[in-house]
């Protein structure tokens, strides 16, 4: 018996061939011997089966001795043995229809679980394997689960069902809702304007929800809410904003915040959360601000940084075009009795400069100038 695998919602064509290459009497029946369709001369006739409005044939092929049964918009319950009777012979075809669906919305938050459920005909014992867009494979029976979805899991999942040594392939598009970056860090000199950007890693027609940025300043004992906002169809509207600092928020996506001045008291880390309508859970992005200040007081030239710096970062003070006078893995360095000239304060990581502040030291009878 020939086995054909079909996909729920698709169209399948079951073949039936006569030895005579001409139009002759044929009909298709199901396993209960109920007639589905057949011919009367050059006319297609239909029987009382449940497939009535979804069954068809190709009249153009009858003259060649081919009498296919076409079933449209396949349902799982169409799985059956179909019998073609032609020329006093019977051809049996077993049709098995499978469906694969995501048990929830296909738009899932980063970190959530995806469960794929296989609908299969009674008595079948299929094996299923799915490959994610990043090449990760999962194998299962009637259900397949992936916990802790990652951003790279966004895209087309290719799932293969094996039954009776035959295969059928499904494609499911999954969108993982997340920010492009889990964390970002901004390095600024004191007094500079700070731009925080929170680009999303997905695009959807309508995006509605609400968000908040909580900030933990390094100098503060507790965190505070800097801003809360609403998102309606990609339009941003501020609900509540702190008075200090005076934050400004862009009205369009990507989410964008401006801090007029980088000051040591603002250095720290924040957590932007975004709750999307009809989704349980929230999107998160961490943002960090590091602020640098270079000062000269009497005979002491000091360079300081505030904010979340890694222990491997190097802070240096050097006279322009000369070797570093002082270089330490600390958040403050200083030089006593600095010689006159343009001094550079550098924050670097493995030789790469992340932040630089220049300060001009005048001869001892003058006051310092900060460019």
């Amino acid at each position: 018996k020939k086995v054909v695998l079909g996909k729920k919602g698709d169209t399948v064509e079951l073949t039936c061939t006569a030895s005579q290459k001409k139009s002759i009497q044929f009909h298709w029946k199901n396993s209960n011997q109920i007639k589905i369709l057949g011919n009367q001369g050059s006319f297609l006739t239909k029987g009382p089966s449940k497939l009535n409005d979804r069954a068809d044939s190709r009249r153009s092929l009858w003259d060649q001795g081919n009498f296919p049964l076409i079933i449209k918009n396949l349902k799982i319950e169409d799985s059956d043995t179909y019998i073609c009777e032609v020329e006093d012979q019977k051809e049996e075809v077993q049709l098995l229809v499978f469906g694969l669906t995501a048990n929830s919305d296909t738009h899932l938050l980063q970190g959530q679980s995806l469960t794929l459920t296989l609908e299969s005909p009674p008595g079948s014992s299929p094996s299923v394997q799915c490959r994610s867009p990043r090449g990760k494979n999962i194998q299962g029976g009637k259900t397949l689960s992936v916990s802790q979805l990652e951003l790279q899991d966004s895209g087309t999942w290719t799932c293969t069902v094996l039954q009776n040594q035959k295969k059928v392939e499904f494609k499911i598009d999954i969108v993982v809702l997340a920010f492009q970056k889990a964390s970002s860090i901004v390095y600024k000199k004191e007094g500079e304007q700070v731009e925080f950007s929170f680009p999303l890693a997905f695009t959807v027609e309508k995006l509605t929800g609400s968000g908040e940025l909580w900030w933990q300043a390094e100098r503060a004992s507790s965190s505070k809410s800097w801003i809360t906002f609403d998102l309606k169809n990609k339009e941003v509207s501020v609900k509540r904003v702190t008075q200090d600092p005076k934050l400004q928020m862009g009205k369009k996506l990507p989410l964008h915040l401006t801090l007029p001045q980088a000051l040591p008291q603002y250095a720290g880390s924040g957590n932007l959360t975004l709750a999307l309508e009809a989704k349980t859970g929230k999107l998160h992005q961490e943002v960090n601000l590091v602020v640098m200040r270079a000062t000269q007081l009497q005979k002491n030239l000091t360079c300081e940084v505030w904010g979340p710096t890694s222990p491997k970062l190097m802070l240096s003070l050097k006279l322009e075009n000369k070797e570093a006078k002082v270089s330490k893995r600390e958040k403050a360095v200083w030089v006593l009795n600095p010689e006159a000239g343009m001094w550079q304060c550098l924050l670097s990581d493995s030789g790469q400069v992340l932040l630089e502040s220049n300060i001009k030291v005048l001869p001892t009878w003058s006051t310092p100038v900060q460019p």
Partner: antibody, heavy 117, light 107 residues
Framework: QVQLVQSGAEVKKPGSSVKVSCKAS????????ISWVRQAPGQGLEWMGW????????DYAHKFQGRVTITADESTSTAYMELSSLRSEDTAVYYC??????????WGQGTLVTVSS | DIQMTQSPSSLSASVGDRVTITCRAS??????LAWYQQKPGKAPKLLIY???RLESGVPSRFSGSGSGTDFTLTISSLQPEDFATYYC?????????FGQGTKLEIK
């Protein structure tokens, strides 16, 4: 990274059996099927059978039906292939490979089985 | 069982050449076809799956095409490390079957 490490070479007498192991690492064992493929000296590749490591379901090539048994032990992430009633023409390198229904993505280093009296 | 026939059985070419290997199935395998490269004493290595999808980490000079019964593996510009034996394999239905192989040698 994904690795399949097979047991060492074997020399067997005709009529006896051989059991080759394949230890998987670098991924969740039940997330891939395992197929076994053999290659006689100077010859091409020949598929022997497959196991669904999730359900234990097996499927064998007709040629080996009744002589081959493929098993998997999830607790040790190891697949096994046992071939019985050995004959000289079973002398070959036996490979285990991950089977995701699309292709054989990762392969073991191979195990040479020599059948000689 | 589905028979897979590769041509040519062997092929001599030079570094920089464009090379094409064909594979024919005895019945339609849709696009359920993979290509492998094997070097002496080593396990085969997957190059292409689903007829035209390049496996991760495989150089882009390798490409596959075809569907139904006729398939092609193309190496756009041969590199010294490409001299090996190449196999096609159908994964449309079990028993899975391989072509007899094409040995690519240096001219």
């Amino acid at each position: 990274q994904v690795q399949l490490v097979q047991s060492g070479a074997e020399v067997k007498k005709p009529g006896s059996s051989v059991k080759v192991s394949c230890k998987a690492s670098g991924y969740t064992f039940t997330s891939y099927g395992i197929s076994w493929v053999r290659q006689a000296p100077g010859q091409g590749l020949e598929w022997m059978g497959w196991i669904n490591t999730y359900s234990g379901y097996t499927d064998y090539a007709h040629k080996f039906q009744g002589r081959v048994t493929i098993t998997a032990d999830e607790s040790t992430s190891t697949a096994y292939m046992e071939l019985s009633s050995l004959r000289s023409e079973d002398t070959a390198v036996y490979y285990c490979t991950t089977d995701d229904f699309l292709s054989f993505g990762y392969w073991g280093q191979g195990t040479l089985v020599t059948v000689s009296s | 069982d589905i028979q897979m026939t590769q041509s040519p059985s062997s092929l001599s070419a030079s570094v920089g050449d464009r090379v094409t290997i064909t594979c024919r199935a005895s019945e339609s395998v849709s696009t359920w076809l993979a290509w492998y490269q094997q070097k002496p004493g080593k396990a085969p290595k997957l190059l292409i799956y689903k007829a035209s999808r390049l496996e991760s980490g495989v150089p882009s000079r390798f490409s596959g095409s075809g569907s139904g019964t006729d398939f092609t593996l193309t190496i756009s510009s041969l590199q010294p490390e490409d001299f090996a034996t190449y196999y096609c394999q159908q994964s449309y239905k079990t028993p899975y079957t391989f072509g007899q192989g094409t040995k690519l040698e240096i001219k």
